[in-house]
Amino acid sequence: AAPCPDACCPHGSSGLRCTRDGALDSLHHLPGAENLTELYIENQQHLQHLELRDLRGLGELRNLTIVKSGLRFVAPDAFHFTPRLSRLNLSFNALESLSWKTVQGLSLQELVLSGNPLHCSCALRWLQRWEEEGLGGVPEQKLQCHGQGPLAHMPNASCGVPTLKVQVPNASVDVGDDVLLRCQVEGRGLEQAGWILTELEQSATVMKSGGLPSLGLTLANVTSDLNRKNVTCWAENDVGRAEVSVQVNVSFPASVQLHTAVEMHHWCIPFSVDGQPAPSLRWLFNGSVLNETSFIFTEFLEPAANETVRHGCLRLNQPTHVNNGNYTLLAANPFGQASASIMAAFMDNPFEFNPEDPIPVSFSPVDTNSTSGDPVEKKDETPFGVSVAVG
């Protein structure tokens, strides 16, 4: 094959090599960019910046090598369009630093930075951590900071991510109230901060105020849906990112729903209760307090993390006709109480039979030590036990 005269030449089925001295000053409009998985660049002293737009359209890129070139700056979002990047070699350039944001979101198996005049400051704490944790082949490079010494020796006691404190109202919050949250940000080299409100949806009207180091957030006309929803304050500095999430408890009265009993492994009378604070529950059976036992008990389903409503069952272990009746669930919290009732029929009463019908009689003696938990009808005046077969 004839030698390729271009600045960049194909290499294999999906690779490109750009090695002609000084031919590139940016990576715009590389031929066949959308299918490239490998890009090798060398001896490009005019290539000094790597920005977001440079790698747009290189969505399939796995390996990027820019070596012995003039690279001085890599933008924090430079690799936004190359999420599959797994090998990044930027050795022997003019890089003094590289932001933690540059590699965030990538699953780099290899990151090569040797031969750069790196400058140690807290901005390289993330790289020092990679070295400590043996990530990306960094330890083998024994990276040096220009004029200082090994990256491994850089002091890092003051290299922390921002510290966040979110103040929430102490007093009870009611539906319709306005709530002011304040996020206090501390730390060195603060760059950006804000709120993440994705969970809120229609739970309140949101108004942001202030800026670093004190961010305000007003949640106006709150609804009960705000409960269990995360309101997150975040902040970034040159070391990394910190997030703190809080929840605002909006008080509202108890409510309850009951559903028709269903037969599962045990019988279940399904219910849903809601309220903030979480209501206390009491069951009534035919108007009297139902004392729970190991045969009749309340069981909750795993709660959803982002809502106050609790779903569950009144579980009945092999109920008989004696358990038929009216079940009422009472729910109460300081803001109100609610109840719901439902009729449940688990089986017919075997003693409500037509005199014409034959009586099934068993001639086995009554087992007085029964531990089955099934109700056993005993007639003292007769030596015979009447057994009821329960399916």
Partner: antibody, heavy 119, light 106 residues
């Protein structure tokens, strides 16, 4: 103990060059970056540049780029700072100092070399 | 370049006084160094990365601060402490020094 001993005072004419030496002892010369800092009479401290004796890697302050050259001789554990095209405002005391990476600071300084530029 | 501004540029104090010198960086830095210099002598390291005392430095010296604002405190000034004090940053190239604070006898 660790010591940096600098060459003696120099008087130079404008336009000339001066080469100041800094002899290191008491440690492994090739393992630590050597820096050069100057102080004009009655003024503060000003960083000139640095050299890594292990491989002659250098870095210079923008202000001195093209006029200063840092070199070293590992056989004698000596670092050199040469400043060319001297002008009167280069009159200063020139110091060499070692950057001690174990504790991350300029721990040992030479005694200083006075360079006077005068016609 | 990051500018380092020291204040005051000079102060007069008596033996036993508590002395505070401040150093402000033009942008946030990772850590700070303090040097002491006496006439005709090379600078002597006092404090490295913000608050650690150099070897042989008496405990009356202390350093604190973060971000852009840093402080050197001498809790009880001694006769040998009359000198010029410099702060220095190396958060980014080039390393830069403050203009100095001269501590004189009142």
């Amino acid at each position: 103990q660790v010591q940096l001993v600098q060459s003696g005072a120099e008087v130079k004419k404008p336009g000339a060059s001066v080469k100041v030496s800094c002899k290191a002892s008491g440690y492994t010369f090739t393992e630590y970056w050597m820096h050069w800092v100057r102080q004009a009479p009655g003024q503060g401290l000003e960083w000139i540049g640095t050299i890594y004796p292990g491989n002659s890697d250098t870095s210079y302050a923008q202000k001195f780029q093209g006029r200063v050259t840092l070199t070293r001789d590992t056989s004698t554990s000596t670092a050199y700072m040469e400043l060319s095209s001297l002008r009167s405002e280069d009159t200063a005391v020139y110091y060499c100092t070692r950057f001690y990476f174990e504790d991350w600071y300029f721990d040992v300084w030479g005694q200083g070399t006075t360079v006077t530029v005068s016609s | 370049d990051i500018q380092m501004t020291q204040s005051p540029s000079s102060l007069s104090a008596s033996v036993g006084d508590r002395v505070t010198i401040t150093c402000r960086a033009s942008s946030s830095i990772s850590w700070l160094y303090w040097f002491q210099q006496k006439p005709g002598k090379a600078p002597k390291p006092l404090i490295y990365y913000t608050s650690t005392l150099g070897s042989g430095v008496p405990s009356r010296f202390s350093g604190s601060g973060s971000g852009t604002d840093y402080t050197l405190t001498i809790s009880s000034l001694q006769p040998e402490d009359f000198a010029t004090y410099y702060c220095q940053q190396w958060h980014s190239y080039p390393p830069t020094f403050g203009g100095g604070t001269k501590v004189e006898i009142k």
